[in-house]
């Protein structure tokens, strides 16, 4: 059967969190998992390598905290489970144009019907180009 | 048959872009793909996890933009396709010694004869030690 | 047979280096490799994707050098072999609260009985939450 895999790319139409993604065009691909309202829905229980990159940039640095989280939601649990996260504080010289990325990637034991999402803190500071901001996984 | 896999390490003799790599000594390894003039040449169509890390450092921070790209070239297409990229702007305090890395990694659907390369913006600012700067992939 | 895989998460009881890890609770998992005194012990020779993330933070930036290394030790070799490393210098504005992560990940050819560890430079600056600081691998 086809391998469970996805590589979702930045969607500039994202207006809220969790982030929404492109699952069809360009370098995006999806197979054996479903994309639903910003989330990847696991079809088959097992071990997955999950990754995400988010590219932040701004015109005038004011060192707002930047958060980047990959979290999991399941109807069996009342709370979201944060799988991986990065926080950035004090990362640029005030008043200047700035840019940098956050990268996360690790192995998790996921269960059928788990939903995975990406959350960030400053939607307006993200560049959604497909090569710069993405979210993916594959079953080991 | 052997798995398609490569881990190429920094080559301090790189004089131009795309970067050149070490494919034989130390932690470097290659199997089922070819290394040719800085590029990894795909032998077998399929899904690959591709990654790269570049370690930048300088002696007197000038905050010149730092770019790190993994791109793909194929004779069927006239233009390079950027798979992943990171740009850094405003990342250090002027005049100070500085150092940091950029890491990229994701899944892509690659076709036999695709060539993958790494491009960076400031060749003179890279430390090519094998543990600090590398480029690799493996077939899922 | 079960796949060789591990995802170890931050252990706030780490008092020295190499770092110690949580291998049981929360998102941690381990199978086909052993966890021993901070290290992952390879059971089966082969190709492995190895990764680690460390989350550094502090209350008053003084730009102390931050190092993050994944290294390998084997009784056959007198010296540790650094597989991957990141060094950070000049990454925050002096005197301010700050936070950022270092991520490493790549493929290595590992041999049965190899021990893998994570080393960092400033133990007191690490946040050991399971989503922020981790260390893992899986056999390709």
């Amino acid at each position: 059967e086809p391998r469970s895999v996805a590589h979702l790319t930045g969607n500039p139409h994202s207006r809220s969190i969790p982030l929404e993604w492109e699952d069809t065009y360009g370098t995006a691909l999806i197979s054996g998992v479903k994309y639903k309202k910003g989330g990847l829905v696991i079809n088959e229980t097992g071990l997955y390598f999950v990754y995400s990159k988010v590219y932040f940039r701004g015109q005038s640095c004011n060192n707002q905290p930047l958060n980047h989280k990959v979290y999991m939601r399941n109807s069996k649990y009342p709370e979201d489970l944060v799988l991986m996260e990065e926080k950035r504080l004090n990362y640029c010289t005030t008043g200047q144009i700035w840019a940098h990325s956050s990268y996360l990637g690790a192995v998790f034991n996921l269960t059928s019907a788990d939903h995975l999402y990406v959350n960030i803190s400053q939607l307006s500071l993200i560049n959604f180009e497909e090569s710069k901001t993405f979210f993916g996984l594959y079953k080991l | 048959e052997p798995r398609s896999v490569a881990h190429l390490t920094g080559n301090p003799h790189s004089r131009s872009i795309p970067l050149e790599w070490e494919d034989t000594y130390g932690t470097a390894l290659i199997s089922g793909v070819k290394y040719k003039k800085g590029g990894l040449v795909i032998n077998e169509t399929g899904l690959y996890f591709v990654y790269s890390k570049v370690y930048f450092r300088g002696q007197s921070c000038n905050n010149q933009p730092l770019n790190h790209k993994v791109y793909m070239r194929n004779s069927k297409y006239p233009e390079d396709l950027v798979l992943m990229e990171e740009k850094r702007l405003n990342y250090c305090t002027t005049g100070q010694i500085w150092a940091h890395s950029s890491y990229l990694g994701a899944v892509f659907n690659l076709t036999s004869a695709d060539h993958l390369y790494v491009n960076i913006s400031q060749l003179s600012l890279i430390n090519f030690e094998e543990s600090k700067t590398f480029f690799g992939l493996y077939k899922l | 047979e079960p796949r060789s895989v591990a995802h170890l998460t931050g252990n706030p009881h780490s008092r020295s280096i190499p770092l110690e890890w949580e291998d049981t609770y929360g998102t941690a998992l381990i199978s086909g490799v052993k966890y021993k005194k901070g290290g992952l012990v390879i059971n089966e020779t082969g190709l492995y994707f190895v990764y680690s993330k460390v989350y550094f933070r502090g209350q008053s930036c003084n730009n102390q050098p931050l190092n993050h290394k994944v290294y390998m030790r084997n009784s056959k070799y007198p010296e540790d072999l650094v597989l991957m490393e990141e060094k950070r210098l000049n990454y925050c504005t002096t005197g301010q609260i700050w936070a950022h992560s270092s991520y490493l990940g790549a493929v290595f050819n590992l041999t049965s009985a190899d021990h893998l560890y994570v080393n960092i430079s400033q133990l007191s600056l690490i946040n050991f939450e399971e989503s922020k600081t981790f260390f893992g691998l899986y056999k390709l």
Epitope: - | Q59, N63, Q64, Q96, I97, S124, L125 | -
Partner: antibody
Framework: QVQLVQSGAEVKKPGASVKVSCKGS????????IHWVRQAPGQGLEWMGV????????SYNQKFKGRATMTVDKSTSTAYMELSSLRSEDTAVYYC????????????WGQGTLVTVSS | EIVMTQSPATLSVSPGERATLSCKAS??????????MNWYQQKPGQPPRLLIY???NLESGIPARFSGSGSGTEFTLTISSLQSEDFAVYYC?????????FGQGTKLEIK
């Protein structure tokens, strides 16, 4: 060839300001930070500060913070150092020097600008 | 800040002889295998001229009779066989951290 050419000598009264220029040529100006160093008559070298020619922000020696202002004009490949509230002890030769980010030291220096502060 | 102390203040040596100049830093100027210590030569009415960078590397165009050594806090500039044009003031300088600091200088004079 690489050159850093500084503006000519200045005589100023105490309390006044002086602005020294340093024009780079023969290289890509925005690839190097510009450092300012001064030398009082018969004395040693004193580092004043550095400016990013790419980004335009500066780091100053605490001793000169608030009195020294460093700027760049990328269009003319020129760096400037302005020192205000001049006192007699500011009498010195002021040097600019370039520093390549990929190397370890200030490799080319301007010829120096003598600033004399006298009432 | 890192304080740089040079010795001696004045060194009198005959042409053709060896000269050894010393520089001590108040704290280590090393990082990641490199020593952030530089040596400059200055003649009257001229700007400083870079001789040695990173403790032991000879700047392009500088004669091989100049050499540098040391690490951590103690550094040495050696001129193996003094020529008449070598009589000048020599400064050490650290670029490990801001503010950059110079030694007070060693005047090398003809004996």
């Amino acid at each position: 060839q690489v050159q850093l050419v500084q503006s000519g000598a200045e005589v100023k009264k105490p309390g006044a300001s002086v602005k020294v220029s340093c024009k780079g040529s023969g290289y890509t100006f925005t690839d190097y930070t510009i450092h300012w160093v001064r030398q009082a008559p018969g004395q040693g070298l004193e580092w004043m500060g550095v400016i990013s020619t790419y980004q335009g922000d500066a780091s100053y020696n605490q001793k000169f913070k608030g009195r020294a202002t460093m700027t760049v004009d990328k269009s003319t490949s020129t760096a400037y150092m302005e020192l205000s509230s001049l006192r007699s002890e500011d009498t010195a030769v002021y040097y600019c020097a370039r520093f390549p980010d990929w190397d370890y030291a200030m490799d080319y220096w301007g010829q120096g600008t003598l600033v004399t502060v006298s009432s | 800040e890192i304080v740089m102390t040079q010795s001696p203040a004045t060194l009198s040596v005959s042409p053709g002889e060896r000269a050894t100049l010393s520089c001590k830093a108040s704290q280590s100027v090393d990082y990641d295998g490199d020593s952030y210590m530089n040596w400059y030569q200055q003649k009257p009415g001229q700007p400083p001229r870079l001789l040695i960078y990173a403790a032991s590397n000879l700047e392009s165009g500088i004669p091989a009779r100049f050499s540098g050594s040391g690490s951590g806090t103690e550094f040495t500039l050696t001129i193996s066989s003094l020529q008449s044009e070598d009589f000048a003031v020599y400064y050490c300088q650290q670029s490990r951290e801001l503010p950059y600091t110079f030694g007070q200088g060693t005047k090398l004079e003809i004996k």
